[in-house]
Amino acid sequence: HNTTVFQGVEGQSLQVSCPYDSMKHWGRRKAWCRQLGEKGPCQRVVSTHNLWLLSFLRRRNGSTAITDDTLGGTLTITLRNLQPHDAGFYQCQSLHGSEADTLRKVLVEVLADPLDHRDAGDLWVPGESESFEDAHVEHSISRSLLEGEIPFPPTS
């Protein structure tokens, strides 16, 4: 799998999309997990509804939400109120039994807010109390890592 980079601005919302073959993954729940190191496990952040027929319902864990268009074949993850600690490597997964297939590898990059919140003027930034439904979702910038780029740079 190539890694797709999604960039979002600190304090705003980032939407990550993971397309998949709806027939191949028919009846399978999905999950969003965070990769802990290059060889480490992928730690589950949030998964779709327990009942596959209700996968379209938005499920939340903290500031992360997930919803699945099972007929169209698109898993969507929303990271709300993006913070620097949200940056890192993630996976979209398709679950079957105790196994998980990787649908997409994702690198989330968090950019500093170029306006800086104190000088934002009339710019509306969704607060913690506001729901996902109300949150303004910025168009994410995404690209695939170029061949030869190292997803996990070696640590000294």
Epitope: W26, G27, N50, L53, L54, F56, L57, R59, T70, L71
Partner: antibody, heavy 126, light 106 residues
């Protein structure tokens, strides 16, 4: 008139099988998720399972206590949903209801059930 | 699995009274909650869906509110025909019902 009518209930011995039918009329059957519920005498409501609309190719989901014993199916040409109950237990004794999942105007659905049948009694006893 | 705790289990009120029933979820269920009315010997009837949306044809004296873990169902002015058992139903986890609230007229 939108209507659901259940049939097939009765007295059955533990370990035996029974098939319930739910005949729909007054709406486009294939566009709706159909569900089964049950209510033991003097008790509350319990979801049994449901079957997806035509778009979902009749995919089924069940509550844990009936999984592997009960099977929901549908016949679009007859507008009938079925509940096949095998290996029945005394604790399966209940009034069984079929119900229609509510559709939003934009075409999605919500697991709220807006049309119900009158119910059919299933008694599992030796 | 999510547990739905409905209270009170029964209540008695006079015609015209405001009646309130609560439903508490064991964890956050957003607004994924419905309310039903069941009269003796009859099938349930959907009254409220998505926590606060009134089902078509249901009298406006019925209302629902809440989100997260705490939900409220209200009959603004109790009528004789409202004698029934009322159930909440979540759909965040599976499809679990509360234990029901039996409403009687004083």
């Amino acid at each position: 008139e939108v209507q659901l009518v259940e049939s097939g209930g009765g007295l059955v011995q533990p370990g035996r099988s029974l098939r319930l039918s739910c005949t729909a009329s007054g709406f486009t059957f294939g566009e709706y998720t159909m569900s089964w519920f049950r209510q033991a005498p003097g008790k509350g409501l319990e979801w049994v399972g449901f079957i997806g609309s035509k778009a979902y190719a009749g995919t089924t989901e069940y509550t844990a206590s009936v999984k592997g014993r009960f099977t929901i199916s549908r016949d679009g040409s007859k507008s009938i949903a079925y509940l096949q109950m095998n290996s029945l237990k005394t604790e399966d004794t209940a009034v069984y209801y079929c119900a229609r999942g509510k559709r939003y105007s934009y075409g999605g659905w919500v697991p709220a059930f807006d049309v119900w049948g009158q119910g059919t009694m299933v008694t599992v006893s030796s | 699995d999510i547990q739905m705790t409905q209270s009170p289990s029964s209540l008695s009120a006079s015609v015209g009274d405001r009646v309130t029933i609560t439903c508490q979820a064991s964890q956050d269920i957003t607004n994924y909650l419905n309310w039903y009315q069941q009269k003796p010997g009859k099938a349930p009837k959907l009254l409220i869906y998505d926590a606060s949306n009134l089902e078509t044809g249901v009298p406006s004296r019925f209302s629902g509110s809440g989100s997260g873990t705490d939900f409220t169902f209200t009959i603004s002015s109790l009528q004789p025909e409202d004698i029934a058992t009322y159930y909440c139903q979540e759909y965040d986890s599976y499809l679990a019902f509360g234990g029901g609230t039996k409403v009687e007229i004083k």
